[in-house]
């Protein structure tokens, strides 16, 4: 389970994203971002410093629209 406001790295980060985002899937950098994919992403925000559940959820993919 997710413990708020702590650093999440490596496998823990991936596992937590899978738990939080579920079937939606997730990104390591927000798709809307125009900056380099490595410049600022979830690794920097959650592993290099601590992050919370709200921030984690911003990296979840948008669910596909059903026809």
């Amino acid at each position: 389970a997710y413990r708020p406001s702590e650093t999440l790295c490596g496998g823990e980060l991936v596992d937590t994203l899978q738990f939080v985002c579920g079937d939606r899937g997730f990104y390591f950098s927000r798709p809307a971002s125009r900056v380099s994919r490595r410049s600022r992403g979830i690794v920097e925000e959650c592993c290099f410093r601590s992050c919370d559940l709200a921030l984690l959820e911003t990296y979840c993919a948008t669910p596909a629209k059903s026809e």
Partner: antibody, heavy 121, light 107 residues
């Protein structure tokens, strides 16, 4: 092909600092995280920290916090690791290692040749 | 920090043998385990990541398995170039930590 070339061996006195460089080639420097790992003579491997060559942000192992500084120069595709307040226990081979994963998983697919740092009075 | 314990610390084997190396984590790490091979005076080489995924270019005689706290590296049909030291490493959380190594020696 991917190559990580480190600077040469160093001999330092206790209390001094050392700065080791690692020049990358054969790939897009800013697209892969870089780690530093050390190995004392005849001993195992010890992770020191990670740097994002794109933004320059870093994360260090608690053990080295306050003594280690990792930086990068994108113009020369080089990362640096500086260790201060050296003691005899810091005698080791220092490796830079590239992370193969976008999630900074610590999967080191390419390594530098290693830099031997000897700390002796 | 997660402690990684390898066994045995050394093993003597002959060319053609099957060698099994075990790695235990002090807490569950799912499948976030890596195996490296290191020869004297050289940098380590990535063999297996995510417990069982073979790194590109690594011979198929190497295989990894396990999850949770217990992991295994198997070398089938041991070749002369396989005599080396093998390290496991957890990639579940920082600090990343390594096992103490297993030296595979010629019998």
């Amino acid at each position: 092909q991917v190559q990580l070339v480190e600077s040469g061996a160093e001999v330092k006195k206790p209390g001094a600092s050392v700065k080791v460089s690692c020049k990358a080639s054969g790939y897009t420097f800013t697209s892969y995280y870089m780690h530093w790992v050390r190995q004392a003579p005849g001993q195992g491997l010890e992770w020191m920290g990670i740097i994002n060559p794109s933004g320059g942000s870093t994360s260090y192992a608690q053990k080295f916090q306050g003594r280690v500084t990792m930086t990068r120069d994108t113009s020369t595709s080089t990362v640096y690791m500086e260790l201060s307040s050296l003691r005899s226990e810091d005698t080791a081979v220092y490796y830079c290692a590239r992370d193969r994963s976008i999630a900074a998983m610590g999967w080191f697919d390419h390594w530098g040749q290693g830099t031997l740092v000897t700390v002796s009075s | 920090d997660i402690q990684m314990t390898q066994s045995p610390s050394s093993v003597s084997a002959s060319v053609g043998d099957r060698v099994t190396i075990t790695c235990r984590a002090s807490q569950g790490i799912s499948s976030w385990l890596v195996w490296y091979q290191q020869k004297p005076g050289k940098a380590p080489k990535l063999l297996i990541y995510a417990a069982s995924r073979l790194q590109s270019g690594v011979p198929s005689r190497f295989s990894g398995s396990g999850s949770g706290t217990l992991f295994t590296l198997i070398i089938n049909n041991l070749q002369p170039e396989d005599f080396a030291t093998y390290y496991c490493q957890q990639s579940n959380s920082v600090p990343l930590t390594f096992g103490g190594g297993t030296k595979v020696e010629i019998k």
